[in-house]
Interface confidence: medium
């Protein structure tokens, strides 16, 4: 018995086709990815194979205006459209809290919503009751295919789930769940969830009976043969695990942002062990039309967008000063609100020892595109922000040793003066540099705000010392020459979209007042 | 193949309730939306509501006051209660599902064959 | 509701011949608009969607066109088993509504 399963991770409200670098869409004729262009290749697999299962590896919330807007509605509705079997609910799920999980998608969500490792208890766990599920036995065919969902154990420090969900540990949730399965008399059975590759890996190897993974988070590309565009393969697709009890078990993620659809075509026995497994995830090329249905609801949509975007979010009474002559060479007052407004997304998880779980910030100087003049009525729009930060990155959290973000601020200042991207602007950072030494030894003083203790105060970097920092995905990528940061990270979560985090500080604070403080010198 | 099969009393009195069950087989009720449709003898045809898999549903305003449509997916069937009947409800009543090809439940295809219900008493 | 208005009510064609049948829908639907061919004792049957999409398993010499607030079903040469009651259906908003009817006659 052969299963279709294709399967999307880490959407991130790509609902429109996007460049090829999943950016805005320019140039239409190269374009890729949407919903509508989507819904072609699924209708079009649905048509010509039997057993089809269509699965979401969780976060389709946050990465563009379209969720700014519409909070999850969007992607209810879209993927109702398009008749997703299932979904696994990602970190990015709990952004605007349970509440904002709870109304737009699981309440209006057509498919199961599913993730065994997440827990309520107190008051929700009667409110959310039977809104996600941990398994969902499927009928596919004249077989029946059970689906057993995980989300990150890490959401609480990425998210905001609040503190009536507990989240455990993958393995130890999911095992008892497929034991449940096999008593059903399921003996298919597909792990779909969002915890990153390395964890796929480990339920393939450490679940007994889970036949499929698949998998999201850590936007990997898998591809078996030449890839068609300019993401590079992490290993072949599927990936093949051994687990300990001696399966072959396939594991599979489809990269990120709607780019390609994942396809993976798995033979069963008639005792649902896997025979053999192969496929590749589907570039969603401009090759691929877009279906003229969903487009024309997507631009019915769209204009809501457009309305939005010239909404003032707040006011500025200083002028905030992005311009390259400032913020490649000093310390600018657009880059200190920019990293003040990327700590402030990112509290949360306090204790009795932390005030927070995170205090620093890193932005490259080249990333910020343009000023914001106060003289406007001091009012701030989305428009002004992307004019901001035009590339639809996302900040991300990342923990690095003290040793390699000393590496990354003597990068930032190795070539001053000529005007290049890699200068850093900060945040719970007090830098000094001096640029009378020669590059790779100008650092002189590297003082970085403590989180546990009480009373924030600035401590002198230490080497050995894992820290978190906040920092854009650009630059958690290796991108302006940090290299560093990308060879010597020790973990990567992708969070939320740039402008996004801006807006909410701007809209939070409603005046803003921005001032060099130095922080660098 | 998906079928669907109408089944219920062909005659009811006028003032009682009208009930229909629609049983689907060849493939699960969980994953679409399901609709009933009339046709009165020589006339056109009328949605009634749908339900989908999982229980939401949606009436035609005109007969929402008197319609409830449920679901029982251990039996694989949906159901159909039109209350306080005339002889105006007399109609063949077919149920059906969405087309495949329709993101929305925008069509239809499969319908059952079709029952027809005479109101009289 | 959207009221869904075809046109003629009954047209009677000879084997062979082409036949148009119009819908037109009191507000746009853009392309939202099925058609299907009913036989006397029979359920309807699905024949094209989203205005022009010929659903599988459906002859090619049928075949539909329209947008907004026209739209047209075509058969192109008209067969034996084409005789019988067309009836348009608009899928934008719900409720969904259908159109009165074409019955095809031999004529």
């Known amino acids: 018995w052969e299963l279709t399963i294709l399967h999307t991770n880490d959407v991130h409200s790509r609902l429109e086709q996007t460049s090829e670098d999943s950016s805005k869409c320019v140039n239409a004729s190269r374009c890729m990815g949407g919903v509508a262009r989507l819904f072609t290749k699924v209708q079009q697999i649905r048509r010509a194979e039997p057993n089809v299962l269509l699965l979401d590896a969780g976060d389709q919330y946050q990465g563009t205006i379209w969720f700014t807007v519409y909070k999850g509605a969007e992607v209810a509705h879209f993927m109702n459209a398009l008749r997703y079997d299932a979904m696994a609910l990602g970190n990015h799920e709990f952004d605007n809290g349970v509440e904002g999980l709870i109304e737009p998608l699981l309440k209006e969500a057509k498919f199961p919503i599913l993730s065994a490792n997440i827990k309520a208890k107190g008051p929700l766990a009667s409110q959310i009751s039977g809104l996600y599920l941990p398994y969902k036995v499927l009928p596919v065919g004249d077989e029946v295919v059970g689906i057993v969902g995980y989300t990150s154990k890490e959401t609480p420090f990425l998210s905001n789930p609040g503190t009536n969900l507990v989240f455990e540990d993958e393995i130890t949730a999911l095992q008892p769940e497929v034991d449940k399965l096999k008593t059903l008399n399921v003996n298919k059975i597909i792990a779909l969830g969002h915890s990153g590759f390395e964890t796929d890996k480990l339920i393939a190897q450490k679940v007994r009976g889970v036949d499929v993974v698949v998998g999201g988070h850590s936007n990997t590309f898998l591809y078996t043969g030449n890839p068609p565009s300019k993401e590079v393969p992490a290993g072949k697709y599927p990936f093949i695990v051994t687990s300990d009890d001696g399966r072959k078990v396939p594991v599979v993620q489809a990269y990120a942002f709607g780019k390609y659809l994942g396809y993976l075509k798995i033979e069963f026995d008639e005792r649902g062990n896997v025979i053999s497994s192969h496929g590749n995830p589907i570039l969603l090329n401009s090759s691929i039309p877009e279906d003229p249905s969903i487009k024309a609801d997507i631009n019915k949509w769209r204009i809501k967008l457009d309305n939005y975007s010239t909404q003032e979010l707040g006011k500025t009474i200083v002028y905030l000063d992005g311009s390259s002559q400032s913020c490649r060479f000093r310390e600018c007052n657009m880059g200190n609100l920019i990293c003040d407004a990327m700590i402030n997304n990112n509290l949360r998880h306090a204790d009795e020892m932390f005030w927070n779980h995170v205090s620093m910030c890193i932005l490259n100087g080249g990333g910020i595109r343009s000023p914001i003049d106060e003289r406007n009525n001091g009012t701030i729009t989305w428009e002004n922000l992307a004019a901001v930060l035009p590339f639809g990155g996302t900040f991300d959290l990342v923990q690095l040793k003290g040793s390699t973000l000393k590496k990354a601020f003597e990068h930032s200042v190795h070539r001053y003066g000529q005007s290049t991207g890699e200068f850093l602007q900060v945040g719970g950072i007090h830098v000094v540099y001096d640029l009378s030494r020669k590059p790779g030894d100008r650092v002189v003083k590297l003082d970085v705000l403590c989180t546990k203790c009480r009373v924030p105060s600035y401590d002198p970097l230490k080497m050995d010392e894992i820290y978190k920092v906040i920092l854009p995905n650009f630059l958690a990528n290796g991108g302006d020459g940090f290299q560093m940061i990308k060879d010597e990270l020790l973990r990567h979560d992708s969070g939320d979209q740039d402008i996004n985090v801006v807006s909410t500080y701007i809209s939070k604070m409603k005046v803003i007042y921005p001032a060099v403080e130095g922080r660098i010198k | 193949q998906v079928q669907l099969q109408e089944s219920g009393p062909g005659l009811v009195k006028p003032s009682e309730t009208l009930s229909l069950t629609c049983t689907v087989s060849?493939?699960?009720?969980?994953?679409?939306?399901w609709s009933w449709i009339r046709q009165p003898p020589g006339k056109g045809l009328e949605w009634i509501g749908y339900?989908?898999?999982?229980?939401?549903?949606n009436y035609n305003p005109s007969l929402k006051s008197r319609v409830t449509i449920s679901v029982d997916t251990s039996k694989n069937q949906f159901s159909l209660k039109l209350s306080s009947v005339t002889a105006a409800d007399t109609a063949v009543y077919y149920c059906?599902?969405?087309?495949?090809?329709?993101?929305?439940?925008?069509?239809?295809?499969?319908w059952g064959q079709g029952t027809l219900v005479t109101v009289s008493s | 509701d959207i009221q869904m208005t075809q046109s003629p009510s009954s047209v009677s064609a000879s084997v062979g011949d082409r036949v148009t049948i119009t819908c037109r829908a009191s507000?746009?639907?853009?392309?939202?608009l099925a058609w299907y061919q009913q036989k006397p004792g029979k359920a309807p049957k699905l024949l094209i969607y989203?205005?022009?999409s010929l659903q599988s398993g459906v002859p090619s010499r049928f075949s539909g066109s329209g947008s907004g607030t026209d739209f047209t079903l075509t058969i192109s040469s008209l067969q034996p088993e084409d005789f019988a009651t067309y009836y348009c259906?608009?899928?934008?908003?719900?409720?969904?509504?259908f159109g009165g009817g074409t019955k095809v006659e031999i004529k």
């Open positions: 059906a599902r969405e087309s495949q090809e329709s993101p929305y439940n925008n069509w239809f295809d499969p």
């Open positions: 060849g493939g699960s009720i969980e994953r679409y939306y």
């Open positions: 339900i989908y898999g999982r229980g939401s549903t």
């Open positions: 507000q746009g639907i853009s392309s939202w």
């Open positions: 989203a205005a022009s």
């Open positions: 259906q608009q899928g934008n908003s719900f409720p969904r509504t």
